[in-house]
Interface confidence: low
């Protein structure tokens, strides 16, 4: 039978690092949208009203907790009138996949903050990323919020040959072992093992010994 | 009247980004969409990708995983990156507009204005 | 994805002919992302029709747009020597936009 005209489809979240936002199609017509988004209480919550907009910022509302399962809806009204209804009394409007931000936000792109070099050892730090989850005022990192289901995975290479190495760490640092002399280069990975979908993140941008994030110390 | 002017980097070598951008004179971003169509040589149009003012983007899937579109309001431009470009990826890239246009209570969408287009090659 | 299919490839008329040109969906469009634009060798496209039948500005009344659902036409109701060029039919409504194949308008 095909969506009714005016009604939005393929509802999509799109989540990195818990900055969430609801994505639909198609562009409006003669109506406008309003996302519905439901709390804890399963209370629906009105967000991005009367907008001709295909995608509404949901993050306020997912990071009051990461953990929670949330739907959305996307309510259509005719242009110019918010209160306007269908044939039924209400609103044409279509359900959201339900979103658990804590199992599905995907993993941003780790940066290397830096790393240093102490005779044939090499402390290598990644950036723990801010995240929009607030806890006391404060925004929380992506080690606040994870913990020790956050793994890093470090790739590193000799920069004058291709043969890679890995190491894994809980933490935000690894400490490996190099060869006296040679530089190396460096990418790392964000990884969730816990997870069932969007386990890792894109790897970081490769970092290499020689330039100016490192130090070295005999 | 609105005039879109575009530059950038007309030869590449393959695995290089691609990166053009588009200048609004004589209006706002505001209101709009703006996007980035391309043309290979002897070849129809194919969409790439629209941001919004406010920056929000739709990308064509085909080439999401490449395409990063971005706005600068204070400048009143738009740009487009193209990631590890080949030889596929020659063509005449043309910024638009993309109007919604309001219409006896409907909205419409269309690319009114365009830019006069930059020949991108990419050969080894 | 909206596949629109463009026919005929090519259209060899005589200035002063009629022009028909159609424009087929792979699924329903709404008629209001439905466009039709105006190319001409080494230029960037020009918009002659949005909402499948509105002219833009500036486009003489010879052009017209018609057409719903799948099915969409542009008619030139006669050919001045400008109007060789080629056309494309535009979806601006689901991602990814899209754009037909093209006719291209000939001199016979």
């Known amino acids: 039978a095909g969506t009714p005209p005016g009604k939005a489809f393929n509802l999509t979240w799109i989540s990195t690092d818990f900055k969430t936002i609801l994505e639909w199609q198609p562009k409006p017509t003669n109506y406008t949208y309003t996302v519905q988004i439901s709390d804890r209480s399963r209370n629906w919550k009105y967000k991005c009203t009367g907008t001709t907009d295909t995608e509404c910022d949901l993050t306020d509302e997912i990071v009051k907790d990461v953990n929670w399962t949330y739907e959305a809806r996307v309510l259509s009204y005719p242009a110019g009138n918010v209160e306007s209804t269908g044939s039924a009394g209400e609103p044409l409007y279509e359900n959201s996949p339900e979103f658990t931000p804590y199992l599905e936000t995907n993993l941003g792109q780790p940066t290397i903050q830096s790393f240093e070099q102490v005779g044939t050892k090499v402390n290598v730090t990644v950036e723990d990323e801010r995240t929009l989850v607030r806890r006391n005022n404060t925004f929380l990192s992506l080690r606040d919020v994870f913990g020790k289901d956050l793994i890093y995975t470090l790739y590193y290479w000799k920069s004058s040959s291709s043969g890679k190495k890995t190491a894994k760490t809980n933490t935000n640092e690894f400490l490996i072992d190099v060869d006296k002399g040679e530089n190396y280069c460096f990418s790392v990975q964000a990884v969730i093992p816990s997870r069932t979908v969007n386990r890792k993140s894109t790897d970081s941008p490769v970092e290499c010994m020689g330039q100016e994030k490192g130090e070295f110390r005999e | 009247q609105v005039q879109l002017q575009q530059w950038g980097a007309g030869l590449l070598k393959p695995s290089e980004t691609l990166s053009l951008t588009c200048a609004v004179y004589?209006?706002?971003?505001?209101?709009?969409?703006w996007s980035w169509i391309r043309q290979p040589p002897g070849k129809g149009l194919e969409w790439i990708g629209e941001?919004?003012?406010?920056?929000?983007?739709r990308y064509n899937p085909s080439l999401k995983s490449r395409v990063t579109i971005s706005v600068d309001t204070s400048k009143n431009q738009f740009s487009l990156k193209l990631s590890s470009v080949t030889a596929a990826d020659t063509a005449v890239y043309y910024c638009a507009r993309d109007t919604p246009y309001y219409y006896e209570g409907g909205y419409y969408y269309y690319m009114d204005v365009w830019g006069k287009g930059t020949t991108v090659t990419v050969s080894s | 994805e909206i596949v629109l299919t463009q026919s005929p490839g090519t259209l060899s008329l005589s200035p002063g002919e009629r022009a028909t040109l159609s424009c087929r969906a792979s699924q329903s469009v709404s008629s209001s992302f439905l466009a039709w634009y105006q190319q001409k060798p080494g230029q960037a496209p020009r918009l002659l029709i949005y909402g499948a039948y509105s002219r833009a500005t500036g486009i003489p009344d010879r052009f017209s747009g018609s057409g719903s659902g799948t099915d969409f036409t542009l008619t030139i109701s006669r050919l001045e020597p400008e109007d060789f060029a080629v056309y494309y039919c535009q979806q601006a409504g689901v991602v990814p936009y899209t754009f037909g194949g093209g006719t291209k308008v000939e001199i016979k």
């Open positions: 941001i919004g003012a406010s920056g929000s983007t």
């Open positions: 004589g209006g706002s971003l505001s209101g709009y969409y």
